[in-house]
């Protein structure tokens, strides 16, 4: 099939990095500067992406592959192929329509991007808070309160009655 195709269409012989030039009797011409063709048999070369402004070049354009961009410092990539750049915030903040805002009490963000997330609720797993959470860090859950009582063993004797609201000494 390949041979048949190449007999019928001389353009199919043109490799990546070239295009089939109709103006020159369908011979394979190299892609002009600042353009590329990533597959063979192309009748035109595509214009290279320019990484300007908020973008900066991560990989230069070649005759066979497009340039790849990332974002200028202070921004991070969003979307396929880094189609947009979004402003970084500090840890402990999230980006809103009005800019970077501190995480509300009870939430945290340990990255420069993304949203503030609620602290882990240790009690849901029957555990206690070992280290308190901050705007930048989640809480650290420790063993359950029962595991921390002095002389705890696999068979725990009944604890003496305590007034409600009083924590164990």
């Amino acid at each position: 099939f390949e041979r048949t195709r190449s007999l019928q269409d001389p353009c199919s012989n043109c490799p990546a990095g070239t295009f089939c030039d109709n103006n020159r009797n369908q011979i394979c011409s190299p892609c002009p500067p600042n353009s590329f063709s990533s597959a063979g048999g192309q009748r035109t070369c595509d214009i290279c992406r320019q990484c300007k402004g908020v973008f900066r070049t991560r990989k230069e354009c070649s005759s066979t592959s497009n340039a790849e961009c990332d974002c200028t410092p202070g921004f991070h990539c969003l979307g396929a192929g880094c189609s947009m750049c979004e402003q970084d915030c500090k840890q402990g903040q999230e980006l809103t329509k009005k800019g970077c805002k501190d995480c509300c009490f009870g939430t945290f963000n340990d990255q420069k991007r993304g949203i503030c997330r609620p602290w882990t609720n240790c009690s849901l797993d029957g555990k206690s808070v070992l280290v308190n959470g901050t705007k930048e860090r989640d809480v650290v859950c420790g063993p359950s309160p029962a595991d921390l009582s002095p002389g705890a063993s696999s068979v725990t004797p009944p604890a003496p009655a305590r007034e409600p609201g009083h924590s164990p000494q």
Partner: nanobody, 117 residues
């Protein structure tokens, strides 16, 4: 393919004026907030001004407030930046961007503005 092409830059004396234009294609211009940013030699990117899709909401950086005016013509798919009372510290490459000051995309080469006597 989204295309943004800036023009109108040049060399101007302090106190002078320039009007930058940005021709947009490849997307529905009237649906998008548009933004001007600039980059001075050896410096990071600085936000200058943004205008909402319909042109009703406009914000400026403190450094250009009262001197620069952003506008748009949705019928012509063009964004503008009128710059008056230019100062040497306004010297930079100016880029127009699709999006807000916090989330944007640029594709043009920019236009050089040099303020010098």
């Amino acid at each position: 393919q989204v295309q943004l092409q800036e023009s109108g830059g040049g060399l101007v004396q302090p106190g002078g004026s320039l009007r930058l234009s940005c021709a947009a294609s490849g997307f529905t211009f009237s649906d998008h907030t548009m933004t001007w940013v600039r980059q001075a030699p050896g410096k990071g990117l600085e936000w200058v001004s943004s205008i909402s899709s319909g042109g009703s909401r406009i914000i400026y950086a403190d450094s250009v407030k009262g001197r620069f005016t952003i506008s748009r013509d949705n019928a012509k798919n063009t964004l503008y930046l009128q710059m008056n009372n230019l100062r040497p510290e306004d010297t930079a490459v100016y880029f127009c961007a699709r999006g807000t000051r916090y989330k944007m995309s640029t594709s043009g080469p920019g236009t050089q503005v040099t303020v010098s006597s």
